[in-house]
Amino acid sequence: EEELQIIQPDKSVLVAAGETATLRCTITSLFPVGPIQWFRGAGPGRELIYNQREGPFPRVTTVSDTTKRNNMDFSIRIGAITPADAGTYYCVKFRKGSPDDVEFKSGAGTELSVRAKPS
């Protein structure tokens, strides 16, 4: 079976404060089994933005129906963007494990820049 790739096609996205940001992510394989999570930043200080299995994550909506078994699109929309949302966002695949899922592979990241609303 094909090795899983995580594709974040946009290196950067510019969004005006108050608007909605779309962060794109697709995967190329359904294996290994396990959830997708989105993070802002990397390393131990990263912020969890979206977890396919838990929530709710009130400002986040998925572009596709991620509950469908063969879904490979894990793009998200984040509403009501503020300057504090700026940063690099990573789409990360986890492998199902016990008791905890294990991080398997990360996308290259999409840098979100926030343009201040003109006052």
Partner: antibody, heavy 119, light 108 residues
């Protein structure tokens, strides 16, 4: 129902240490950033510290930086605040507060734990 | 840092009357402003977020409005149980998270 219950408050002398705990239930604790907010007698609310969902990212108010340490145990659904080198001006009720999302307001508050620093 | 200024410091209103509380930010916070209610001897409770959205279980006599730098919390028909201190909180720029100094609502 979301519940946040603080414990560990008490009376200490200046320069001593104390550790507060906050037991969380009713939500997916590991998915949310958590905060400590304090209120000195007869005063308003002062944000003290924040920790991200995974525990690797922390922020502190200038007034406590270098003296207080926030941490969490996601397996035990518990938030902590280690307070060292306590001063009289740290006397307050300390509330733990759940964050609505990674960049948001505080949607649930604990009942508070009273810390009194007095010689 | 964004400073939040609440006015008036104290507001005395008769039951059934309207109470209007103000919160002004030193720089724009968009619509990222919340209101919390704290009754004597109790923990704060979220009332309003995103300037105008009522939190779960909050009666509709509480409403919020405003954007940018000027915000208002209105209690349309004051009840005796609304006697409390009300704090605004911004979450547009952080850290630190900032609260206003509070407005104490008293029943006449």
């Amino acid at each position: 129902d979301v519940q946040l219950v603080e414990s560990g408050g008490g009376v200490v002398r200046p320069g001593e240490s104390l550790r507060l705990s906050c037991a969380a239930s009713g939500f997916s604790f590991s998915s949310y950033a958590m905060n400590w907010v304090r209120q000195a007698p007869g005063e308003g609310l002062e944000w003290v510290s924040r920790i991200n969902s995974g525990g690797g990212g922390t922020d502190y108010a200038e007034s406590v930086k270098g003296r207080f340490t926030i941490s969490r145990d996601n397996s035990e659904n518990t938030l902590y605040l280690q307070m060292n080198s306590l001063r009289a001006e740290d006397t307050a009720v300390y509330y733990c507060a759940k964050q609505y999302d990674w960049n948001g307001f505080f949607d649930y508050w604990g009942l508070g734990a009273l810390v009194t620093v007095s010689s | 840092e964004t400073v939040l200024t609440q006015s008036p410091a104290t507001l005395s209103v008769s039951p059934g009357e309207r109470a209007t509380l103000s919160c002004r930010a030193s720089q724009t916070v968009g619509s990222k402003l919340a209101w919390h209610q704290q009754k004597p001897g109790q923990a704060p409770r979220l009332l309003i977020y995103d300037a105008s959205r009522r939190a779960t279980g909050i009666p509709d006599r509480f409403s919020g409005s405003g954007s940018g730098t000027d915000f208002t919390l209105t209690i349309s028909s004051l009840q005796t149980e609304d006697s409390a201190v009300y704090y605004c909180q911004q979450y547009y720029y952080w850290p630190p998270y900032r609260f206003g100094g509070g407005t104490k609502v008293e029943i006449k």
